[in-house]
């Protein structure tokens, strides 16, 4: 069916398909060291890996995209691994009056799917 | 700033960066000919093209991903071009009792961004 459940076993082998991975990054890496005080080192969850046919399809569009990619690979790209949801984080910001807590709702991925 | 506006001019040349493109597909292409009656031919808008540094960044995560891809290209993938919104479509479905109208909210892309 067009609304088949997303496939969750990776046909390419362990760790090859779309998944969440932790990447260490410093404020300097991000170019944020001028206004973010802390933490200086961030554990950023990101979505990495391939999206083989119907693996973790985000929605109907992604399923169709996967199918058309099989038929017209030069014209239609394969789905790719992107965040499905985010975990909000709070960082300490430098302000004119001292330090404040700053919310980032869309900085750290919480889950991934193929879109 | 971490919340810089997404860049909208493509540094790779016309038509190379993430954009919406119409793809023709038949119900047979989609594997839907058993239960969708009409239309037999669909014009599906899909997101195609590359995501150079900070081009149409979906959010803070995508900006960070672009930056870290520049620093660690083997570990962090570049952002990729995916739908930012969808246009609902109505298809005619075959049912046990005849024909019904079925809405698909997430079949046709309406806009694209780099995530």
């Amino acid at each position: 069916s067009a609304h088949a459940h997303p496939r969750d076993s990776c046909p390419l082998g362990p760790g090859r398909c779309c998944h969440l991975e932790t990447v260490q990054a410093t404020l300097e890496d991000l170019g944020w060291s001028d206004w973010v005080l802390s933490p200086r080192q961030l554990q950023l969850s990101m979505c990495v890996g391939e999206c083989p046919h119907l693996y973790r399809s985000a929605n109907t569009h992604a399923q169709i995209k996967a199918r058309l990619h099989g038929l017209q690979p030069d014209k239609v790209p394969a789905p790719c691994c992107v965040p499905s949801s985010y975990t909000p984080v709070v960082l300490m910001h430098r302000t004119d009056s001292g330090v404040s807590l700053q919310t980032y709702d869309d900085l750290v991925a919480r889950g991934c799917h193929c879109a | 700033s971490a919340h810089a506006h997404p860049r909208d001019s493509c540094p790779l040349g016309p038509g190379r960066c993430c954009h919406l493109e119409t793809v023709q597909a038949t119900l047979e292409d989609l594997g839907w000919s058993d239960w969708v009656l009409s239309p037999r031919q669909l014009q599906l808008s899909m997101c195609v093209g590359e995501c150079p540094h900070l081009y149409r960044s979906a959010n803070t995560h995508a900006q960070i991903k672009a930056r870290l891809h520049g620093l660690q290209p083997d570990k962090v993938p570049a952002p990729c071009c995916v739908p930012s919104s969808y246009t609902p479509v109505v298809l005619m479905h075959r049912t046990d009792s005849g024909v019904s109208l079925q809405t698909y909210d997430d079949l046709v892309a309406r806009g694209c961004h780099c995530a």
Epitope: T26, S38, R40, T87, V89, V90, M92, V99, L101 | -
Partner: antibody, heavy 120, light 107 residues
Amino acid sequence: QVQLVQSGAEVKKPGATVKVSCKASGYTFDSYGIHWVRQAPGQGLEWMGWITAYSGDTVYAQKLQGRVTMTTDTSTSTAYMELRSLRSDDTAVYYCARESGQTSSALGPWGQGTLVTVSS
Amino acid sequence: DIQMTQSPSSVSASVGDRVTITCRASQGISRWLAWYQQKPGKAPKLLIYAASSLQSGVPSRFSGSGSGTDFTLTISSLQPEDFATYYCQQGASFPLTFGGGTKVEIK
């Protein structure tokens, strides 16, 4: 693994000053801030303030402003909390806690705690 | 300051029970809530941050939910090692503030 080891218990007279230390290991000390929290006997948790080891920036709870000073020594990966003009209601277990790796305003891991008793 | 109110202040339960603790903030804090477990004579331990994200190494029987002003910590099947006091803490603005605690006791 990440560890915070605090100095031993102290008994102080009212009006005195106490300085509690918190030695960090298992991570890059100046990458994360340190929070200080206290807990009076049989009571709940009270946040005292925060310091970033990297720049020395601090935020103190309003009710302790003027009596508390938080410092760090990056050469020894140690954070310090000094509380002056001690009163009997300052009797508590004092904890240091690192910012969590995920978010600055969540606390973990924690030190084992230092009991400070203020008594004449 | 943002006040955090926990309820109940204590709960008696048996091993295997489902236990729910609630925490209410005096003003909206989005998802900026953490939950801690403290055993007698020990330091608190972070269980959940950002309302529902499980801290690494914490068993999956612990879960958190909520946003805005109302939050919940659920222990799906109470284990002997879960008898402790649980605190919520808001991380939306300074000063950081804690709830009064909920003691989970053996029935």
